[in-house]
């Protein structure tokens, strides 16, 4: 699996999950989240050659097409597969509120 | 929706489904499919700016991050959303066989 266990400990050039820390204030301009100040969101990056963690029948065909037509702009793309939630604290008036923001952290990637 | 109805009739620069015809023999090197000779597979292409058909909470965050950090390599990617099957005919010996290959045709795209 192209997950954090494999990708963070290798020098993989193909589609893999990469480290990315997002500071809510600096990177998003968000002041409304009290805690945490930022989080390890991660992101997916890298080419998707033939048979590399391909998502569907279509992505197999497209990877094969791309292999035979390397100049073509049609190619599978490396995108999130498994996502995890992030618990946050924000204020409503003076009252702190805890909420889970779903699908916020990338744990693994796929070629789609 | 970023589907064939909208995308094929517009000059949309952002993420949209684009026309792509794949000739099985010329593009994939396949002789084993008897019918059809090729098909309109289509593909997804175009940038994914903030709020453009974003798939998850994470892709919204990443698009916003990208807006604030335009040089960053972390950005959502335009990938297939709705896929349709393709019926094919091939031969096993002298016997024709009809099969539906699932998820072969892109009907719409999303930013993931």
């Amino acid at each position: 699996a192209l997950d954090t266990n494999y990708c963070f400990s290798s020098t993989e050039k193909n589609c893999c999950v990469r480290q990315l820390y997002i500071d809510f204030r600096k990177d998003l301009g968000w002041k409304w989240i009290h805690e945490p100040k930022g989080y390890h969101a991660n992101f997916c990056l890298g080419p998707c050659p033939y048979i590399w963690s391909l998502d569907t029948q279509y992505s197999k065909v497209l990877a094969l097409y791309n292999q035979h037509n390397p100049g073509a702009s049609a190619a599978p793309c490396c995108v999130p597969q498994a996502l995890e939630p992030l618990p946050i604290v924000y204020y409503v008036g003076r009252k702190p509120k805890v909420e889970q923001l779903s699908n916020m952290i990338v744990r693994s990637c796929k070629c789609s | 929706a970023l589907d064939t109805n909208y995308c094929f009739s517009s000059t949309e620069k952002n993420c949209c489904v684009r026309q792509l015809y794949i000739d099985f023999r010329k593009d994939l090197g396949w002789k084993w499919i008897h019918e059809p000779k090729g098909y309109h597979a289509n593909f997804c292409l175009g940038p994914c700016p903030y709020i453009w058909s974003l798939d998850t909470q994470y892709s919204k965050v990443l698009a916003l991050y990208n807006q604030h950090n335009p040089g960053a390599s972390a950005a959502p990617c335009c990938v297939p959303q709705a896929l349709e099957p393709l019926p094919i005919v091939y031969y096993v010996g002298r016997k024709p066989k009809v099969e539906q290959l699932s998820n072969m045709i892109v009907r719409s795209c999303k930013c993931s």
Epitope: Y50, I51, Q57, K60, V61, L64, H68 | R25, L28, G29, W30, K31, W32, Y90, V92, E99, L101, S102
Partner: nanobody, 120 residues
Framework: QLQLVESGGGLVQPGGSLRLSCTAS???????????MAWFRQTPGKQRELVAL??????NYADSVKGRFTISRDNAKNTVYLQMNMLQPEDTAVYVC????????????WGQGTQVTVSS
């Protein structure tokens, strides 16, 4: 039972040659069409890298092996070959074959791999 058996690996000196073969056995390979056959290689701590790929009438090679390696197939024997010439130490790896079969969709099967070591 589906099986891919590779052979032909071994120890060879730089500049030498080897011919790998991968034979697909099992009823699936006789009944269903093969849509692609490929050779990949794997070095310790790295994922598999595509070396060569063949479909019915097209072949494709990694830049690092172009002009030195040749992929071919014998449909009657359900076998794919990899002729490797002018081998270099950086070609040292486990070579694994992959066969794509049309069986309720595009299915892929992996072999166990054969070790190729290029050293003087």
């Amino acid at each position: 039972q589906l099986q891919l058996v590779e052979s032909g690996g071994g120890l060879v000196q730089p500049g030498g040659s080897l011919r790998l073969s991968c034979t697909a056995s099992g009823s699936t390979f006789e009944i269903y069409p093969i849509y692609a056959m490929a050779w990949f290689r794997q070095t310790p701590g790295k994922q598999r890298e595509l070396v060569a790929l063949t479909t019915d009438v097209k072949t494709n090679y990694a830049d690092s092996v172009k002009g030195r390696f040749t992929i071919s197939r014998d449909n009657a024997k359900n076998t794919v070959y990899l002729q490797m010439n002018m081998l270099q130490p950086e070609d040292t790896a486990v070579y694994v074959c992959n066969v794509g079969v049309v069986r309720g969709g595009l299915q892929n099967y992996w072999g166990q791999g054969t070790q190729v070591t290029v050293s003087s």
